[in-house]
């Protein structure tokens, strides 16, 4: 964006789009101010990602004011949690992880409310929140879809998030980040499939076919690799 963005200072509660390598600009909120005393996060803001309810530390160059940027970045995207995030930033901007509601704070001096899913410490570590890997503190970055036609199939919407015929076993996600009992580990999870627009909902495999992806978003998604250390910790619907 413009250079002026790099100089922008944010305060607690500010709504932004946050950019992490390999991911689209993500709706987020400034949760903590930079503290020069903490070397690892000096000049970085702790941001809370809407939709995934995860946190990361980002510098101002990767943050973009929400109101000014929503026309540019606020378009539906196939990444898991993105549309939920767009909805939350508009309708529930004070949401906290696990349903904790925060009040907008003027400064970050006060103790934050408990956030079981957000780990303290380095920016590349997070608690085992929705979308993060099973190994606590580490992030899994999803690989870009291998085929063009796979990409289109991944954007789905409410009412078409499950398939009639499960394709492969996968551990069910738990939005509360709780440990699962052994009995529930091998839950059949559907794999989204390509579908025609306007297919009859009752037909097997009918899903919400995606609107055309924009080239800009396609390119960004290609950047995502296993080596990306920082990301909102979200997965494509493929991982359903």
């Amino acid at each position: 964006m413009s250079r002026s963005n790099r100089q922008k200072e944010y305060k607690c509660g500010d709504l932004v789009f946050a950019k992490m390598k390999g991911y689209p600009h993500w709706p987020a909120r400034i949760d903590e101010m930079p503290e020069a005393a903490v070397k690892s996060t000096a000049n970085k803001y702790q941001v809370f990602f809407f939709g995934t309810h995860e946190t990361a530390f980002l510098g101002p160059k990767d943050l973009f004011p929400y109101e000014e940027s929503k026309e540019k970045f606020g378009k539906p995207n196939k990444r898991k949690g993105f549309s939920e995030g767009l909805w939350e930033i508009e309708n529930n901007p004070t949401v906290k992880a696990s349903g904790y509601q925060s009040s907008q704070k003027k400064s970050c001096v006060e103790e934050p409310e408990p956030e079981p899913e957000a780990a303290e410490g380095d920016g590349d570590k997070k608690g085992n929140a929705e979308g993060s890997s099973d190994e606590e503190g580490k992030l899994v970055i999803d690989e870009p879809a291998k085929e063009k036609n796979e990409k289109g199939a991944l954007k789905r919407r409410a009412g078409d998030l499950l398939e009639d015929s499960p394709k492969r076993p996968k551990e069910a996600e738990n939005p509360e980040g709780e440990e699962k009992e052994a009995a529930t580990l091998e839950v059949e999870r559907p794999l989204p499939m390509e579908v025609e627009k306007n297919s009859t909902p009752s037909e097997p495999g009918s899903g919400r076919g995606p609107p055309q992806e924009e080239e800009e978003e396609e390119d960004e998604e290609e950047e995502a690799t296993k080596e990306d250390a920082e990301a909102p910790g979200i997965r494509d619907h493929e991982s359903l």
């Epitope: 909805w87 349903g99 919407r157 409410a158 499950l162 069910a172 839950v187 059949e188 999870r189 306007n198």
Partner: antibody, heavy 120, light 106 residues
Framework: QITLKQSGPGIVQPSQPVRLTCTFS??????????VAWIRQPSGKGLEWLAT???????RYNPSLKSRLAVSKDTSNNQAFLNIITVETADTAIYYC????????????WGQGTLVTVSS | DIQMTQTTSSLSASLGDRVTISCRAS??????LNWYQQKPDGTVKLLIY???RLHSGVPSRFSGSGSGTDYSLTISNLEPDDIATYYC????????FGGGTKLEIK
Amino acid sequence: QITLKQSGPGIVQPSQPVRLTCTFSGFSLSTSGIGVAWIRQPSGKGLEWLATIWWDDDNRYNPSLKSRLAVSKDTSNNQAFLNIITVETADTAIYYCAQIYDYAVGFAYWGQGTLVTVSS
Amino acid sequence: DIQMTQTTSSLSASLGDRVTISCRASQDISNYLNWYQQKPDGTVKLLIYYTSRLHSGVPSRFSGSGSGTDYSLTISNLEPDDIATYYCQQYGKLWTFGGGTKLEIK
């Protein structure tokens, strides 16, 4: 502030068509990701989802009612419509419309409901 | 079609009680579950979305949990204003509601 208000004919005769209108404010059905859902509730019974109209007209219907329902919209006047092609006495119910966002966020805001009575 | 079952159609509780309302899906719905409150006057409100997330303006005494096919809504400190019928709803494959649980004060 998001508000939705349903309106309809009140009483209608069996086998006649019915058109219900949902007039809303605070959002637009031309905005990517926005939809309006129609839900009904027969007296003393539970909620039943009927249909959803999305911003891009890729709509969804309850399979058991699909042949009798059609949804449409007038984005410039902030209205969504539910057409029941031929009503039956079993269609007597309170009809609600609700705003829905693209992915996982539920029927976020509801209208107050309008009663449709099918009677000869 | 995915069926949603709320086995308890009505329950009575005292003010201040902790109340849990359960809901079961006919198949794994991957946490794609919402809870709604319908007041006696017919007003319907979204309480919880995506199993456990509190909708804007909903008091924190409401919480949701569950996974796979079994889900629950908990009201931690029952207040007079909570007298209503509560519905679960899946949105993984189209949308279906549970039959509702009517909550009354003892």
